[in-house]
Amino acid sequence: EVEKTACPSGKKAPEIDESLIFYKKWELEACVDAALLATQMDRVNAIPFTYEQLDVLKHKLDELYPQGYPESVIQHLGYLFLKMSPEDIRKWNVTSLETLKALLEVNKGHEMSPQVATLIDRFVKGRGQLDKDTLDTLTAFYPGYLCSLSPEELSSVPPSSIWAVRPQDLDTCDPRQLDVLYPKARLAFQNMNGSEYFVKIQSFLGGAPTEDLKALSQQNVSMDLATFMKLRTDAVLPLTVAEVQKLLGPHVEGLKAEERHRPVRDWILRQRQDDLDTLGLGLQGGIPNGYLVLDLSMQEALS
């Protein structure tokens, strides 16, 4: 807490300008009017204040707005945002995407801080859903943002927002998250033609069920191995050798290199060795010829 001291004669700041960088902390406290600071916040970012000086400016704004800053001030916080605590940010009502962008710019290139996480949470809750423009903005600054959300939070993403998602935004998503996102993507891209649809849906396929993979196998999509390896094991297991061959097209040869890894390993164990041999890849571990395969899960469902 800075002591209350009278402003020396001739030092009262008539405006926020570069001369203030030569003021000591107590002089800033005593000689800068908080209301003036609030109306001229847009100038602060253009002045090379030190961290210590920014502390004093924050203290002045806190006194002026004990219930939380108005958006007109928040939008121009600039580097002062780095001085805010999550508790400060919880008092804000940020509704403008421009304000959000301005504050994210301050933290650009750095890990998502608790302050930024709180800001985003406040903003998204205020909007009621994660709309396309917001998602566009957030993934531009934090490509991993989408995958940091819980499946419950992702459920509030409208299908229209999926258009803003880039493949790299899904890199760190786990299967539970893709389970939520895939149906939304399927809905969002449903009016696209075959090849265009596959390009868009590809990065979401980690959430696709067996029937959708079977349908894709009929469309000459030539799925690459990296995508295939991210598919749900339970969705891959029921696919026949012929379906996998159609699904992968020329990439089917890559199965050999992945035969010890999931889901390929588990899928091989479910196939007849005879069928695997038709691929000519030397895949081993299928069901030997002459063995009877009982699908117990089907039997249980019928009983």
């Epitope: 970012n45 002045i47 204040f49 961290y51 780095l82 710019e105 750095h110």
Partner: nanobody
Framework: EVQLVESGGGLVQAGGALRLSCAAS????????MGWFRQAPGKEREFVAA????????YYADSVKGRFTISKDNAKNTVYLQMSSLKPEDTAVYYC???????????????WGQGTQVTVSS
């Protein structure tokens, strides 16, 4: 790992000119404000100039205003200090530094280059 590498120092006659360069990693360059400082023998490190990442604002120490120009090339992740009308009192080791904020205080700069010697003879 953050790396700042200065170059361009040397010996020059009073009234002459030099251009210092500071190459940074792309991540540092795009997320930091960049500053130039100098330190003469037996003296404290002194602020010379800074360029703000947000808005591109520039600030100079009074001692170099009108003679030095700070600039940056985003494509090359490089910040420059063009020095002209050099004086013997400009003799020092010049350092490039990066900060999360736009500040005139050396304390606020997290990463520093190794420095490049500038000597101005009379």
């Amino acid at each position: 790992e953050v790396q700042l590498v200065e170059s361009g120092g040397g010996l020059v006659q009073a009234g002459g000119a030099l251009r210092l360069s500071c190459a940074a990693s792309e991540r540092t360059f795009s997320s930091s404000s960049m500053g130039w400082f100098r330190q003469a023998p037996g003296k404290e490190r002194e602020f010379v100039a800074a360029i703000n990442r947000i808005g591109g604002h520039i600030y100079y120490a009074d001692s170099v205003k009108g003679r030095f120009t700070i600039s940056k090339d985003n494509a090359k992740n490089t910040v420059y200090l063009q020095m002209s009308s050099l004086k013997p009192e400009d003799t020092a080791v010049y350092y490039c530094a990066s900060s999360r904020i736009y500040s005139h205080s050396a304390r606020d700069y997290d990463y520093w280059g190794q420095g490049t010697q500038v000597t101005v003879s009379s």
